[in-house]
Interface confidence: medium
């Protein structure tokens, strides 16, 4: 039988009446066009909705926008357009919401052509009030908040000036001209690239990388011949042009650009690119594009300094610079990532790693599924997940994979079961153990979201027709109930729930159409009465993450330690609640070869835990450049995975000798770097 329709499914009692009493409709009068929604703060219940309608005229486009505010998670909205003087807000800048619970909001207004500068509306009280501020420049980008201090803003102007405000946008100062890209680092530091001659495009590869740690009082040039730069975890990366040709190499710094090392990664040519797929304070996943228009490249994983890299995955699908990759961090279980590879026959297959890139495997075939037409052997196939690439190809995939840190082990995704991703209409699959095993959860494409830290999963069928039914599950997707939330169907445009998956409210957005007009409408459903009581100790069970062989003493060991979690029993219908904290008990493991990545010059053949020398480097001395000195690496092929906490057990030899020789990395060496003050 179809999922959720077998005899074992117990129904949630009287749910229709309970949900009907907690379903709140809001019709947005006389509005068409586009709508954008932002949550202001965490657990505040404040939502801002901006609707815009562009009216195309022969010569120009003018628009109207309306601003609405809710302070009860979307159950009621108040039109607050008058607080922004009925000004047309530019949707391409979105609503710039301040970090954490600062309550800050910046809206960028459309101004007439001849004006001296742009205009913003600022709120620091969760959008209860706004202050209009005329800018001394026309913004090119959305205002960016410093992560450390929400009063500090930066923006680039249309004339490539870097502007900074120290009082939440009240007063602005241009701290540098000819700026291409600017980013906040840690401790209110700003990193930015500048051009000397023509423009950002013309000087690509000849840009300078600058740093200011005092909001523009003084500057330090920390790099030259820069193509681009990026920040990830505690690492600062720059791609730098080589002296002799048009190739670029990645350089990395862990001290805000004071010292740099050349990353042991292949150089790339003009048509290629590097991309930081994921980064934390321990390590980095880096994609290096293959030469030619192949649509794939190689994933490398770094050591704890971001310098020495090991090959992690070949033929990694990544279409073009700024293009599509399916690389997904499964946030509901440590060490798990999912992505796609482009196989030799140009089919796309999904791969998963449970140990932060150490080893990749196919996804296990779901128990309740048949292999589709892509499978050569009808009994042997795997699950393939649809993510960004499928969405970009306009396949019938409304949503990317979903996981939440506080819904431990749960991963929801569209997929197909075969030898490769299928273009047929996908179904929705769920894993409750972080990707080790999967079950078909819903037939056909759906929108889905997680509420109450996994206590409720909500889904809406993806259809071109108007809809009026929502599905929900209180047992991690095993059984489903359907609820008709409105008599008159609506064209569905999106599900919105508060980020963090702690809320029990879901908003269904769409529009109704009468004969000539359409109106935005939202239905907010509060599930609090479905989960009538708070969860107690008896509602939770102990679960060992990454468990594959309960007989094995080392079962569950990943990255040198195992974790036991308290997880809600599927049969328990209760509230985790907004204050729910994931309870876990870690324990250290003995080291095995699984705790080591292959060192520079080594690789791990498929289905083997041993690292072997790369043929092209056999017999060569392994030397690399570190902080401008040449280092000699003595290794038997292993290095500990960053973040691995194992102790004892296997301990491969690894030694780095300073060769006391200078080496250059196409970068300004620290002693030559200059500083200047404003």
């Amino acid at each position: 039988s179809a999922p959720g329709e077998d005899e074992e499914c117990g129904r949630v009692r009287d749910f229709v009446a309970k949900l009907a009493n907690n379903t709140h409709q809001h019709v947005f009068d006389d509005l068409r066009g586009s709508v954008s929604l932002s949550w202001v703060g965490d657990s505040t219940g404040v939502i801002l909705v901006l609707t815009t309608f562009h009216v195309p005229l022969v010569i120009m486009t003018f628009g109207q926008s309306k601003l609405y505010r809710s302070e009860d998670y979307g159950k009621n909205f108040k039109d607050i357009t008058d607080l922004i003087n009925n000004t047309f807000i530019r949707t391409e800048f979105g609503m710039a919401i301040g970090p954490e619970n600062s309550g800050k909001v910046v809206l960028t207004a459309e101004v007439s052509g001849g004006s001296r500068g742009g205009r913003i509306f600022r709120s620091s009280d969760f959008a209860k009030n706004f202050v209009q501020t005329d800018l001394p420049f026309h913004p090119l980008t959305q205002m960016m908040y410093s992560p450390q201090n929400s009063d500090y803003l930066l923006a680039l102007s249309t004339e490539n000036g870097l502007w900074v405000s120290k009082n939440f946008g009240g007063k602005w100062e241009e701290i540098h001209k000819a700026v291409c890209l600017a980013k906040w680092g840690s401790d209110n530091t700003i990193f930015f690239t500048t051009y000397a001659n023509g423009s950002c495009k013309a000087d690509l590869g000849a840009l300078e990388l600058w740093r200011t740690s005092d909001l523009g009082k003084s500057f330090k040039t920390i790099g030259v011949k820069i193509y681009s730069f990026g920040l990830g975890g505690r690492f600062l990366f720059a791609s730098v042009m080589a002296d002799k040709d048009t190739t670029r190499r990645i350089h990395v710094s862990t001290d805000q650009g004071d010292t740099w090392s050349m990353a042991q990664l292949p150089s790339v040519g003009q048509e290629q690119f590097y991309s930081i797929l994921a980064a934390n304070d321990d390590m980095v996943f880096m994609h290096v594009d293959e030469p030619g228009d192949t649509g794939f490249g190689t994933i490398f994983t770094s050591d704890d300094r971001g310098i020495v890299y090991s090959k992690s995955l070949d033929r990694h699908l990544y279409t073009t610079t700024g293009g599509e990759t399916d690389f997904t961090n499964v946030t509901s279980l440590r060490g798990v990532y999912i992505t796609s590879v482009l196989s030799e026959d140009n089919s796309i297959q999904t791969m998963i790693t449970f140990d932060q890139g150490g080893r990749w495997t196919h996804l296990r075939k779901p128990e309740n599924s048949e292999c589709d037409a892509t499978a050569k052997n009808k009994n042997e196939c795997s699950l393939h997940i649809h993510a960004s690439y499928s969405i970009s190809q306009k396949l019938n995939v409304p949503m990317a994979p979903l996981s939440e840190p506080n819904a431990v082990g749960i991963v929801i995704a569209h997929g197909s079961v075969g030898d490769a991703i299928s273009v047929m209409v996908p179904d929705v699959y769920i894993s409750d153990d972080g990707g080790y095993s999967w079950t078909k959860m819903l037939e056909g494409p759906h929108y889905y979201t997680i509420l109450d830290s996994g206590g409720i999963i909500v889904a809406i069928e993806h259809s071109s027709r108007p809809i009026n039914v929502i599905k929900f599950s209180t047992d991690e997707g095993q059984c489903w109930q359907t609820y008709t939330f409105t008599r008159d169907p609506i064209y569905f445009t999106g599900l919105a729930s508060e980020p963090g998956a702690r809320s029990m409210n879901i908003s269904i957005w769409g529009f109704t159409e009468s004969f000539l007009t359409s109106q935005w409408v939202s239905y907010t459903i509060d599930f609090k009465d479905i989960l009538e009581r708070n969860c107690e100790e008896k509602d939770y069970t102990i679960w060992l993450a990454h468990s594959t062989d309960p007989e094995d003493y080392e079962d569950g060991c990943i990255l040198g330690y195992k974790e036991q979690f308290l997880r809600l029993r599927k049969s328990s219908v209760c509230q985790n609640g907004r204050d729910y904290v994931v309870t876990k008990q870690p324990s250290i493991c003995l080291c095995s070869l699984e705790d080591f990545l292959c060192d520079f010059g080594y690789y791990r053949p498929e289905n083997d835990s041993k690292c072997v020398e790369q043929p092209e480097l056999k017999g060569h001395d392994l030397e690399f450049c570190l902080y401008g000195r040449e280092e000699h690496l003595t290794t038997n092929g292993y290095r500990k995975i960053p973040g691995d906490k194992c102790q004892g057990g296997v301990n491969p030899v690894r030694e780095v000798k300073d060769l006391k020789k200078k080496c250059t990395s196409n970068f300004l060496s620290p002693e030559k770097q200059n500083s200047k003050s404003n």
């Epitope: 068409r32 066009g33 027709r465 108007p466 008159d488 169907p489 064209y491 445009t493 529009f511 109704t512 159409e513 009468s514 004969f515 000539l516 007009t517 359409s518």
Partner: antibody, heavy 124, light 106 residues
Framework: QVQLVQSGAEVKKPGSSVKVSCKAS????????ISWVRQAPGQGLEWMGG????????NYAQKFQGRVTITADESTSTAYMELSSLRSEDTAVYYC?????????????????WGQGTTVTVSS | DIQMTQSPSTLSASVGDRVTITCRAS??????LAWYQQKPGKAPKLLIY???SLESGVPSRFSGSGSGTEFTLTISSLQPDDFATYYC????????FGGGTKVEIK
């Protein structure tokens, strides 16, 4: 090429009802709007109401509210207009017309395809 | 409901004449106006939508202008096939037609 084909002429007694059908062929039906417009002999055009078949909800001109019912069956690409409590002044040619529209936007394209018209005569 | 007033109700003209028909709305309807041509015993035919957009297949001698409450249909050079009745129609919320303008041979 979309065509709207209407049902044949009707002669009705005062107080009775008439139901006129309008079948679309040769194109999509659901996402458009269908209007019903009537024209009494020697008179101008009068809009009665309309429906978006995909939604099934109809809008009516105030004058006809309570007396007219407009429905649509997407599976057969057919729209219907039923007028009740007929009187002699309801004698007219009744047209259905397709109305181009852009989903989610207030954007009116005009009635670009018309049926051939159905003559309804109300006489005792 | 919004009232649409068309003028003149009858217009006599000759082939080659430039003909202008006016339509006034009782309140602003932005640009949500269409013009139709109807010949005796036939269904109306769409000429102009959104006040000034020419429906495909309609000769370029027909043009529409105006916004808000005042709208105009112009036939730049009247042809024998153009003798007919012309209706304006607004589409702001509900639909209403103007009373019609009959263009006859002078």
């Amino acid at each position: 090429q979309v065509q709207l084909v209407q049902s044949g002429a009707e002669v009705k007694k005062p107080g009775s009802s008439v139901k006129v059908s309008c079948k679309a062929s040769g194109g999509t039906f659901g996402s458009y709007a269908i209007s019903w417009v009537r024209q009494a002999p020697g008179q101008g055009l009068e809009w009665m109401g309309g429906i978006i078949p995909q939604f099934g909800t109809a809008n009516y001109a105030q004058k006809f509210q309570g007396r007219v019912t407009i429905t649509a069956d997407e599976s057969t690409s057919t729209a219907y207009m039923e007028l009740s409590s007929l009187r002699s002044e309801d004698t007219a040619v009744y047209y259905c017309a397709r109305q181009g529209r852009k989903t989610g936007y207030y954007y009116y394209y005009g009635m670009d395809v018309w049926g051939q018209g159905t003559t309804v005569t109300v006489s005792s | 409901d919004i009232q649409m007033t068309q003028s003149p109700s009858t217009l006599s003209a000759s082939v080659g004449d430039r003909v202008t028909i006016t339509c006034r709305a009782s309140q602003s309807i932005s640009s949500w106006l269409a013009w139709y041509q109807q010949k005796p015993g036939k269904a109306p035919k769409l000429l102009i939508y959104k006040a000034s957009s020419l429906e495909s297949g309609v000769p370029s001698r027909f043009s529409g202008s105006g916004s808000g409450t005042e709208f105009t249909l112009t036939i730049s050079s009247l042809q024998p096939d153009d003798f007919a009745t012309y209706y304006c129609q607004q589409a702001d919320g509900h639909i209403t037609f103007g009373g019609g303008t009959k263009v006859e041979i002078k």
